[in-house]
Interface confidence: medium
């Protein structure tokens, strides 16, 4: 058993048929000795009397808010949550496996630059009685501070018959050093509580591995005289780290016909312009990636050839 | 070539070679994100490698103030990785394929370190840890870890030389 926050406790249970459960002893937090009774949740049924209550916690029916009273007055209460372990593995019922980049990926995180700011998100099909709390640090044995905001519902999607809810959180490393080579990973821990079920999810990464720049901005076409060629130009996204002479990007320019089946022409360049042939009804797209470290490409920025 | 006594290196040459190093490091181990090597208890292996840290003066301001601190740190790292790539971790079984980019990577690390340190000018280098795994699979895992770590190191080095070439070249 351990304390999640004041008066909220998590009981870790091996979850299998006829498991013995855990014997938990609750003591009423009061100097009173006599006339104390215990109830569970909203029920008025008296579970026991006396300063201590011993319960065998085996299933969700044994969890909940235990309250001790005297003469109609509430003296103290303790909320017991359950954390299930099946076949030695902690349950992951609350969040959806995103399966990207690999199986058992419940949390996904991205950073737009090297400032130490990043966003993580996760998915669930649960709509009510759900709370999340997020903690983060750089390293685990001697952790350095990372401050995370509150998790918020950021999107709702319909997937077949089910609704899917996306939650996200923004975190900022307290004393980030954008130019340094990271040696300790960022650790992100999400506590999830659904009704009386507790679960925790973790992710560990280097900022450099979760970098995904915003798309290039101000994408423009300038036709070249007496030619089917155009000069495409663009700028670094505003959110990218500066100076750009240090934090450089590389770019991929793509000419794509109207039909997805048409051959795509691609050019790679470190410059912020390129000359390409603009076919009728085609579009030109540009995306960006860190020049020196192969993290994710940005989304495409596009303009029509016409 | 760099000149002893703390004057500027050949920023543009260093820029070109460090960018080539980035390309080679990624072609030697392109598996980004597919193998979470940090779960394989790599504290004792890759924690020993030299990292370019916050106080090493490799940020734009630090380079403007005095690039020698940073260049010395980069040189240490290049020598360290050059020795690792020449050790039995990479020369032992399982043998590298004849066209493996590791050979080129090894030569380029040496080339860049020589650009940074001319004859008769010696910076102290870090001791290479005695990592000699007995099993071929351990060697393979260690190679991946070293290459992943090298990718991060050369990325910072390449940023330094790109910025130097753009802003500090005479």
């Amino acid at each position: 058993i351990w304390e999640l926050k004041k008066d909220v406790y998590v009981v870790e249970l091996d979850w299998y048929p006829d498991a013995p459960g855990e014997m938990v002893v609750l003591t009423c937090d009061t100097p009173e000795e006599d006339g104390i009774t215990w109830t569970l949740d909203q029920s008025s049924e008296v579970l026991g009397s006396g300063k201590t209550l011993t319960i065998q916690v085996k299933e969700f029916g044994d969890a909940g808010q235990y309250t001790c009273h005297k003469g109609g007055e509430v003296l103290s209460h303790s909320l017991l949550l359950l954390h299930k372990k099946e076949d030695g593995i902690w349950s992951t019922d609350i969040l959806k496996d995103q399966k990207e980049p690999k199986n058992k990926t419940f949390l996904r995180c991205e950073a737009k630059n090297y400032s130490g700011r990043f966003t993580c998100w996760w998915l669930t099909t649960i709509s009510t009685d759900l709370t999340f709390s997020v903690k983060s640090s750089r390293g685990s044995s001697d952790p350095q501070g990372v401050t995370c905001g509150a998790a918020t519902l950021s999107a709702e999607r319909v997937r077949g018959d089910n609704k899917e809810y996306e939650y996200s959180v923004e975190c900022q490393e307290d004393s980030a050093c954008p130019a340094a080579e990271e040696s300790l990973p960022i650790e992100v821990m999400v506590d999830a509580v659904h009704k009386l079920k507790y679960e925790n999810y973790t992710s560990s990464f280097f900022i450099r591995d979760i970098i995904k720049p915003d798309p290039p901005k101000n994408l423009q076409l300038k036709p070249l005289k007496n030619s089917r060629q155009v000069e495409v130009s663009w700028e670094y996204p505003d959110t990218w780290s500066t100076p750009h002479s240090y934090f450089s990007l590389t770019f991929c320019v793509q000419v794509q016909g109207k039909s997805k089946r048409e051959k795509k022409d691609r050019v790679f360049t470190d410059k912020t312009s390129a000359t390409v042939i603009c076919r009728k009804n085609a579009s030109i797209s540009v995306r960006a990636q860190d020049r020196y470290y192969s993290s994710s490409w940005s989304e495409w920025a596009s303009v029509p050839c016409s | 070539r760099a000149v002893p006594g703390g004057s500027s290196p050949a920023w543009t040459q260093c820029q070109q070679l460090s960018q080539k190093l980035c390309t080679l490091a990624w072609s030697a181990h392109p598996l980004v994100g597919h193998m979470d090597l940090r779960e394989e208890g790599d504290e004792e292996t890759t924690n020993d490698v030299p990292h370019i840290q916050c106080g090493d003066g490799c940020d734009p301001q630090g380079l403007r103030d005095n690039s020698q601190f940073c260049l010395q740190r980069i040189h240490q790292g290049l020598i360290f990785y050059e020795k690792l790539l020449g050790s039995d971790i990479f020369t032992g079984e399982p043998s590298l394929l004849p066209d493996s980019p590791v050979g080129q990577l090894h030569a380029s690390l040496l080339g860049l370190s020589q650009l940074l340190q001319p004859e008769g000018h010696h910076w102290e280098t870090q001791q290479i840890p005695s990592l000699s795994p007995s099993q071929p699979w351990q060697r393979l895992l260690l190679r991946f870890k070293i290459l992943r770590s090298l990718q991060a190191f050369v990325a910072v080095a390449a940023r330094v030389f790109a910025h130097g070439a753009a802003t500090l070249s005479p």
Epitope: W2, E3, L4, K5, K6, V25, T27, C28, S78 | -
Partner: nanobody, 124 residues
Framework: EVQLVESGGGLVQPGGSLRLSCAAS????????MYWVRQAPGKGLERVAP????????LYADFVKSRFTISRDNAKNTVYLQMNSLKPEDTAVYVC?????????????????WGQGTQVTVSS
């Protein structure tokens, strides 16, 4: 300097009782969960019982079966283990420990403070 000093161990006959004490100093005792753990000859560490800072929540290991009671006195910086109906298999070194964490005690990273332990021998 952090110190945890156990006392109260000794030789006792089966069915007998002992009260172990653990006096703490050098850290904010009232912020920490406290644990009694034991190590029998040739066996690994076994957690006997944890107790939250307020002394209101505990959970006993299966082998305890209502025979042991853990309590604490935050004014005296002391945690106790009252052991009744002792059996030969309770023979072990009993150690008090504080886990690495105060309020948020996940206890994944082991114990941060340890005592030296007190020997309990149950034999006729």
């Amino acid at each position: 300097e952090v110190q945890l000093v156990e006392s109260g161990g000794g030789l006792v006959q089966p069915g007998g009782s002992l009260r172990l004490s653990c006096a703490a100093s050098g850290f904010t005792f009232s912020n920490y969960w406290m644990y009694w753990v034991r190590q029998a000859p040739g066996k690994g560490l076994e957690r006997v019982a944890p107790l939250n800072p307020g002394g209101t929540i505990t959970l006993y290991a299966d082998f305890v079966k209502s025979r042991f009671t853990i309590s604490r006195d935050n004014a005296k910086n002391t945690v106790y283990l009252q052991m009744n109906s002792l059996k030969p298999e309770d023979t072990a070194v009993y150690v008090c420990a504080a886990p690495s964490g105060t309020l948020y005690t996940r206890n994944k990273s082991g114990y941060i403070y340890w005592g030296q332990g007190t020997q309990v021998t149950v034999s006729s």
